[in-house]
Amino acid sequence: SQVSQNCHNGSYEISVLMMGNSAFAEPLKNLEDAVNEGLEIVRGRLQNAGLNVTVNATFMYSDGLIHNSGDCRSSTCEGLDLLRKISNAQRMGCVLIGPSCTYSTFQMYLDTELSYPMISAGSFGLSCDYKETLTRLMSPARKLMYFLVNFWKTNDLPFKTYSWSTSYVYKNGTETEDCFWYLNALEASVSYFSHELGFKVVLRQDKEFQDILMDHNRKSNVIIMCGGPEFLYKLKGDRAVAEDIVIILVDLFNDQYFEDNVTAPDYMKNVLVLTLSPGNSLLNSSFSRNLSPTKRDFALAYLNGILLFGHMLKIFLENGENITTPKFAHAFRNLTFEGYDGPVTLDDWGDVDSTMVLLYTSVDTKKYKVLLTYDTHVNKTYPVDMSPTFTWKNSKLPNDITGRGPQ
C-alpha cells in the first residue's frame, strides 16, 4: 500500500532498517554510529550550501525473537515484516537504507511499489542487478565477474602472456554472504563468467579441492575461491601444490593485506588475492575505531548511503524539485558524490564502482605486493608491478592448461 513519506516542508527523514539478519555480523550499534556520523556531515554540507533544512534518521528494528539466525537465510520475511511495520506506523522516510541480504532486497523490491529509493550495503547477488530504484554501495557479483573475465582473457601483460579459458571454482556452502553470492554468480550456467569460459567445474568437497592441487589430469591450473587466508589454510594446509597452480582468492572487503607489519604466510605463495583498494582516512575515524578490517567497508557503506542521500537532496532542493517523486527515486545512479573517504562513483544501474587490486606474495620479501589494479567503471586493467617476484616459472603466470602453447 502507499505510505505517506516524511519528506517535505524542510524536514527530511531517512528510514534505516536495522535487521537482525545481515550480510555481515556487525553490531547494530556500530551501524547506528556510522549513520549518525553521516548525518552530521550531511547537515554540515547542506548548511554550507545555504539550505536550512532538517535531516534525521529513523532506525527500524525488527522482532529479534522471530528472525534470529543472524545470517541472511531467514532475511526474506524479516525485510517484508519491517516494511509492514513501516506501513502500519505510516512512517516512511524519503529513502530506505538497508537491507543488506540479497534474499530480502530481492523480495522487498518485488513486493513493494517502490516510488522511493532503496540504498543497500550488500545485496550482492545477480538477482539484484538492474533494479531501477536500488543503489548498492558494496561491489556486487556482476563487478567481480567482469573483472575475472577481463583478467582471464588478458594476455598483453609482462607477467601474463596467456589468455585463460578454464577454471575450477571452490564452493562448499559455508561461505559468508558476500562470498556466497560471488561464487553463486560464477557457478550459474547462464552467467557472463560461465558463458565466456570454455571449461568450469565447481568443487564442493574439501577433498576434491585437495586432490586437484597435485592431479596430473586436472583440466585447469586455476582455482577461484572466496574468503581470507585462514580459510584457505584450513582447506589447503601445508599440502604440496603443483608449480603451475594459481589460486585466486577473492577477499574484497579486507584491508589487512595493506597493513605495514603483515607478512604473507608460506601457503600464500601460489595465491593471487583480489581485494579492494583500501581507504586512507578510515583507520583513524571515530566510527571505524572499533571495527575489524573486514567490517569497515560495511559500516562505511551505511555512512556513504547517508552521504549519497544528502548529495541528492541538495541537488533536488537547489533545483527546486520535489523529493517524493519517481524522478528522485530513479536519480541515485550514473553519478559521483563525495563519500566519507573520497569520491564514490555509481554506474548506470546504481552500483558502486571501485578499484579492485590483485595482490601476489613476493618470494623475496614475503610481503603482499600489488600486481595490478582494475577499474570497474571502465572495465580496464592497469599493471602496477611490471616484474613481479612470483613463485611461478620465469616470473610469469602459467597457462591455465598444462602443456598448451601460446594463445
Epitope: V149, N150, F151, K153, D156, P158, S163, V370, S387
Partner: antibody, heavy 118, light 113 residues
C-alpha cells in the same frame, strides 16, 4: 601541452655506460607509463622496455635484460634509461615515448643520439 | 613475440596519387579482454622522431590530415594515403599493442618518384 624533452647527444667508449634522461611536462607524470625505443642508423624501431612512474616498476625486452636500467624521479617528472657494457651496435637514437593507453605510444621525445666508438 | 611484416619496404609514389602500405601480424591482434584491436601506424620524417597517425586500426590522431586512413582486422592491416603530398615522405611503421611485448614492423620508406 604534452612535452617530452630528452638530454643531449653522447659519445661513449665500448664497455662504458650511458644515462639518458627524458623530462615530461603538460600532464600528470605518474598517471602514464613510459617506454624507451631505440633506432640504429638506417634501421627500424626497437622496443627496449617500460617503466611505471607511479611505483617505479619496470619490464625490459629480453635482448636488454641485465644491461638496461630504467628509473624515474617524480619530483622532477623525469625518467632515465641507463645502458651499460656499451658496444658499437648500441650506436642509435634513443627515444622515450609516453604510453597513452596500455601499449599505445602517443607522444615521443625528440630522441638522443648515443655514439659508441673507440 | 608477435612478428609484424610490412610490405612493400620501399614505395616510390607520384605526388597527388594514392599510396597503400600493408602490415601483417603473425597472430590475430584482436585483444580478447576488451574486444579492441591495438594496431597503430607511425610516420617518421627524416631526422625527426616518430609521430602517431592512426591508433586502434582506424582512429586518426588529432591534427592528422584526413587523407590518411587505416583499415583491416585480425592479422591484415592497411594504411592508405588518398593523395600523396610532399610532407608525407619518410618511413611508416605499424606497431601492435595487443600482445606482450609490443612490436614494430620493419618500416616502409615512402619517397616521391
Amino acid at each position: 601541452q604534452v612535452q617530452l624533452v630528452q638530454s643531449g647527444a653522447e659519445v661513449k667508449k665500448p664497455g662504458a655506460s650511458v644515462k639518458v634522461s627524458c623530462k615530461a611536462s603538460g600532464y600528470t607524470f605518474t598517471s602514464y607509463y613510459m617506454h624507451w625505443v631505440r633506432q640504429a642508423p638506417g634501421q627500424g624501431l626497437e622496443w627496449m622496455g617500460i617503466i611505471n612512474p607511479s611505483g617505479g616498476s619496470t619490464s625490459y625486452a629480453q635482448e636488454f635484460q641485465g644491461r638496461v636500467t630504467m628509473t624515474r624521479d617524480t619530483s622532477t617528472s623525469t625518467v632515465y634509461m641507463e645502458l651499460s657494457s656499451l658496444r658499437s651496435e648500441d650506436t642509435a637514437v634513443y627515444y622515450c615515448a609516453r604510453d597513452g593507453q596500455w601499449l599505445q605510444f602517443d607522444y615521443w621525445g625528440q630522441g638522443t643520439l648515443v655514439t659508441v666508438s673507440s | 613475440d608477435i612478428v609484424m611484416t610490412q610490405s612493400p619496404l620501399s614505395l616510390p609514389v607520384t605526388l597527388g596519387q594514392p599510396a597503400s602500405i600493408s602490415c601483417r601480424s603473425s597472430q590475430s591482434l584482436l585483444k580478447k579482454s576488451d574486444g579492441n584491436t591495438y594496431l597503430s601506424w607511425y610516420h617518421q620524417r627524416p631526422g625527426q622522431s616518430p609521430r602517431r597517425l592512426i591508433y586502434k586500426v582506424s582512429n586518426r590522431d588529432s591534427g592528422v590530415p584526413d587523407r590518411f586512413s587505416g583499415s583491416g582486422s585480425d592479422t591484415d592491416f592497411t594504411l592508405k594515403i588518398s593523395r600523396v603530398e610532399t610532407e608525407d615522405v619518410g618511413i611508416y611503421y605499424c606497431m601492435q599493442g595487443s600482445h606482450w611485448p609490443p612490436t614494430f614492423g620493419q618500416g616502409t620508406k615512402v619517397e616521391i618518384k
